[in-house]
């Protein structure tokens, strides 16, 4: 479960609300910052099938988050 | 069941305008948001706009920048694409696409949409 900076938002409108857990290849969140004023969770799909942003207030999207950060804490 | 039902196209002359709709029903709509995509005869289809109902956000290809706006009732569950100054190359058939989860990259990306109208011709003659 990475975290890394960028310069902007990277996700725009809806969320998927749910991705199912054997089509996820990695998580990465990246909280609150200057760049960005929310917290995203982009999904990282298997067989080169792209990214998806979750979200954040869904709840496999709460779970990510409560796993990376008890993991880093 | 899922439909998005495109209408408002035809026959205008270059320089004229018109006023698509996509009407949208069988899902909640704030959990997605709609692309416009267009397709010419031999061509690949490209996304012209997209609107995001949930915050208001849009995004226009360059293409179409300063000619085409996006908007959406929320009440109605309908997209609406406004288009002016049309020319000869904006001839094409019309679609509206409803997805979520985008990234800031992919909101041209076909794959991402998860339904889709049956389109409408827009034929704009000089």
């Known amino acids: 479960f990475p975290m890394f900076k960028r310069g902007r938002c990277l996700c725009i409108g809806p969320g998927v609300k749910a991705v199912k857990v054997a089509d996820i290849e990695k998580a990465s969140i990246m909280y609150p910052s200057n760049n960005c004023d929310k917290i995203e969770v982009i999904i990282t799909l298997k067989e080169n099938k792209g990214q998806r942003c979750l979200n954040p207030k869904s709840k496999q999207a709460r779970l990510i988050i409560k796993k990376v950060e008890r993991k880093n804490f | 069941e899922v439909q998005l039902v495109e209408s408002g196209g035809g026959l205008v002359q270059a320089g004229g305008s018109l006023r698509l709709s996509c009407a949208a029903s069988g899902f909640t709509f704030d959990d997605y948001a709609i692309g416009w995509f267009r397709q010419a005869p031999g061509k690949e289809r490209e996304g012209v706009s997209w609107?995001?109902?949930?915050?208001?956000?849009?995004y226009y290809a360059d293409s179409v920048k300063g000619r085409f706006t996006i908007s959406s009732d929320n009440a109605k569950n309908t997209v609406y694409l406004q288009m002016n100054s049309l020319k000869p190359e904006d001839t094409a058939v019309y679609y509206c696409?409803?997805?979520?989860?985008?990234?800031?990259?992919?909101?041209?990306?076909?794959?991402?949409?998860?339904?889709w109208g049956q389109g409408t011709q827009v034929t704009v003659s000089s």
């Open positions: 609107i995001s109902s949930s915050d208001g956000s849009t």
């Open positions: 696409a409803a997805g979520a989860g985008f990234l800031i990259t992919t909101i041209w990306t076909t794959q991402m949409y998860d339904y």
